[in-house]
């Protein structure tokens, strides 16, 4: 199903807050089309906060959302605003900080039960072999039980990011998952399109590293929606 495809790349078991590998995952698509469950573990402070113009949530960092800076303000003037913490009022999931979602107008803990990870890739391939039913490959974030083995190095087989060493995440490479490097500043990253795509993304990038978020490059703002380039940028 399309939902299976949309969920096919969520990265399981991102590192806990302030521990392990860089834990700054992006937003991911939920099982319900068009609904975003922000993921991740890091709360952004508003120190040195620079207004960043935007038209949609995807253009903001994973711990930001796009809205008018003043209540009831001009909808045409929108900037990336710091996410709203637990128990704060919200109107949609993207407003809530990573690890939370919007329920009945209040940001509540997602309790590790929703998809996480900035993981849709740029290469899309519609294929027509005997697997063309697009097997369900949904991936949910859960906190791992005790580590049972040495953590994998780059290229190692994995099922979730906790299987990988610090600085790596577990991501799709063709039809299996391997440990890949967490993205550094300036590297191209991938933002989920909430409406998804009709192909199957067969490669995944990791999320951006600590202190970085996946944003559209300023010089690409004028480009068409389909070709806008996102890179890992400092908050």
């Amino acid at each position: 199903t399309l939902n299976s495809v949309l969920n096919s790349n969520a990265i399981k078991n991102l590192p806990p807050p302030l521990g392990g590998a860089a834990g700054h995952p992006g937003s991911a698509v939920s099982a319900a089309p068009g609904i975003l469950y922000p993921g991740g573990n890091k709360y952004q402070t508003i120190d040195n906060y620079q207004p960043y113009p935007c038209a949609e949530d995807e253009e903001c960092g994973t711990d930001e959302y796009c809205a008018s800076p003043t209540r009831g303000g001009d909808a045409g003037v929108q900037i990336c605003l710091a996410c709203r913490k637990r128990r704060k009022r919200c109107m949609r999931h993207a407003m809530c900080c990573p690890g939370n979602y919007c329920k009945n107008g209040i940001c509540v803990s997602s309790d590790q039960n929703h998809f996480r990870g900035e993981i849709e890739e740029t290469i899309t391939e519609s294929f027509g072999n005997d697997h063309s039913t697009l097997d369900g490959y949904s991936r949910r974030t859960t906190l791992s039980s005790k580590m049972y083995h040495t953590k994998g190095q780059e290229g190692s087989v994995c099922l979730r990011s906790s299987d990988c060493a610090s600085g790596l995440c577990c991501a799709r490479h063709f039809w299996s998952k391997i440990c890949k490097p967490v993205l550094k500043e300036g590297q191209v990253c991938t933002k989920h399109r909430r409406k998804g795509s009709h192909g199957l993304e067969i490669f995944q990038r990791c999320y951006c590293g600590e202190g970085l978020s996946c944003r559209i490059q300023k010089d690409h703002h004028q480009a068409s929606n389909s070709s806008r380039l996102h890179t890992c940028q400092r908050h």
């Epitope: 490959y137 049972y148 290229g155 190692s156 099922l159 979730r160 063709f174 299996s176 391997i178």
Partner: antibody, heavy 117, light 107 residues
Framework: EVQLLQSAAEVKRPGESLRISCKTS????????MHWVRQMPGKELEWMGG????????SYNQKFKGHVTISVDKSSSTAYLQWSSLKASDAAMYYC??????????WGQGTLVTVSS | DIVLTQSPASLAVSPGQRATITCITS??????MNWYQQKPGQPPKLLIS???TLRPGVPARFSSSGSGTDFTLTINPVEANDVANYYC?????????FGQGTKLEIK
Amino acid sequence: EVQLLQSAAEVKRPGESLRISCKTSGYSFTENTMHWVRQMPGKELEWMGGINPHKGGTSYNQKFKGHVTISVDKSSSTAYLQWSSLKASDAAMYYCARDWLGAMDYWGQGTLVTVSS
Amino acid sequence: DIVLTQSPASLAVSPGQRATITCITSTDIDDDMNWYQQKPGQPPKLLISEGNTLRPGVPARFSSSGSGTDFTLTINPVEANDVANYYCLQSDNLPYTFGQGTKLEIK
């Protein structure tokens, strides 16, 4: 058609070395992780470990780590499972299985390993 | 490691009837469960993969349900050639772990 063809049955003595193989065809070998699974006589299946041919990265079940080595030869699209010193308890059927989005979709026919003094 | 407790160990079902096999996991694995059929002298065959997805070529008589910790494989109606061992496999967390197996016999 995807095929995984495993090497023939082996009869060995304890302490001997052994390498069994799994030759693949019908798909791009480097695009899928290859797993090895053990089935002792009349018992359930046990995942031993896997290797992704792209960079040769492996992961092992702790139960088997240090006792077996998983490797690949990309030029011949073949995966290997190797023991440097067999034990009597290694007697079992061994399967290679291709990974497809987390599941093991295609399996070899199995290699029966007998270890007897 | 995640422990999979499969039951029953064996069951006998009349042709045309329903067979139900359950698998309970020691921790929540969402819907990352797979089901296999293994006939004597053969390797396991994947019936159903993650997300309760029926594999291409597998008859619709086979179905699965469940998420979290409780999973069920249902064969309805059972046919004579369904005699086999059935295994569940979790693919949520390394190491992959299998259930102990269920032997299906025909009455």
